[in-house]
Amino acid sequence: GSVPPMVNVTRSEASEGNITVTCRASSFYPRNITLTWRQDGVSLSHDTQQWGDVLPDGNGTYQTWVATRICQGEEQRFTCYMEHSGNHSTHPVPSGNSHHHHHHHH
């Protein structure tokens, strides 16, 4: 059977006026997954995102991540899109005060 990913979006200061947003998917099986940043619901070009390999996380499941840089104040325009085993979800960037955003998908 399949195990849905836990999706976690974080943000960190990049340079003045910009922030780096990172979307991590973990504890999923099988390893095939789509994880990408969308701007206004449209996927960013591959060369404007940084990608992590899909790696085993030690429990027979897998983990990966994707990151991009955005303008501070434009967080609402960006979502992390995840597709796994026929299910999909979108995950917003947390507001400045909150640095973690966890979702488990079934």
């Epitope: 701007q39 619901g41 996927s43 840089r69 609402q76 979502t79 979800s89």
Partner: antibody
């Protein structure tokens, strides 16, 4: 086949409101945003805003803030554009559109003509 | 708001001619992460617009290879290598790098 079916033409009085619908078919509705675009007669195109059907989140052109409300009904795969306090300036064709993987308006509805007249 | 200025407003052509439309943005539309959301649309009378080019230079599915897009920063160009009758209509450039998204005023390609 991916389609966006829009509601029919509307003739409304100044000061009234109107609700234009856009029903999606041929794909999973919550996978893609729905955009709304205005085209006044013989004029260029104007972006109104968009809604993410998965989260219900919206981003709008400030020019339309307070006058245009975007909503969705996931159960019927339908997006709505609600315009209030209409004036003759709002007489236009209103389009809904859907993005694709890397592009913004890959699929368009046929447009809904709204005429504001007393 | 970012102003998208298209030139010319009207472009009379003979079938088989090359046509070139310019679109200039009032500021750079390269986003912080390097993404440039610049698209071209063609609208024929009584029809919805149709997507031709996305992310500056990528042809949309089913668009003939006589259409090409180029440019960067603030200056963008759509070229039609050999105009055919089905290419007549109004062409719009569109930027979605910054909110509010904005369209150019349109270029009408018509028979000379």
């Amino acid at each position: 086949e991916i389609q966006l079916q829009q509601s029919g033409p509307e003739l409304v009085k100044p000061g009234a409101s109107v609700k234009v619908s856009c029903t999606a078919s041929g794909y999973a509705f919550t996978k893609y945003n729905i955009y709304w675009v205005k085209q006044s007669h013989g004029k260029s195109l104007e972006w109104i805003g968009y809604i993410d059907p998965y989260t219900g989140g919206t981003i709008s052109n400030q020019k339309f803030t307070g006058r245009a409300t975007l909503t969705v009904d996931k159960s019927s795969s339908t997006a709505y554009l609600h315009l209030n306090s209409l004036t003759s300036e709002d007489s236009a064709v209103y389009y809904c559109a859907r993005p694709g993987s890397y592009w913004y308006f890959g699929v368009w509805g046929a447009g809904t003509t709204v005429t504001v007249s007393s | 708001d970012i102003l998208m200025t298209q030139t010319p407003l009207s472009l009379p052509v003979s079938l088989g001619d090359q046509a070139s439309i310019s679109c200039r943005s009032s500021q750079s539309i390269v986003y912080t992460n390097g993404n440039t959301n610049l698209e071209w649309y063609l609208q024929k009378p009584g029809q919805s617009p149709k997507l031709l080019i996305y992310k500056v230079s990528n042809r949309f599915s089913g668009v003939p290879d006589r259409f090409s897009g180029s440019g960067s920063g603030t200056d963008f160009t759509l070229k039609i290598s050999r105009v055919e009758a089905e290419d007549l209509g109004v062409y719009y450039c569109f930027q979605a790098s910054y909110v509010p998204f904005t369209f150019g005023s349109g270029t009408k390609v018509e028979i000379k």
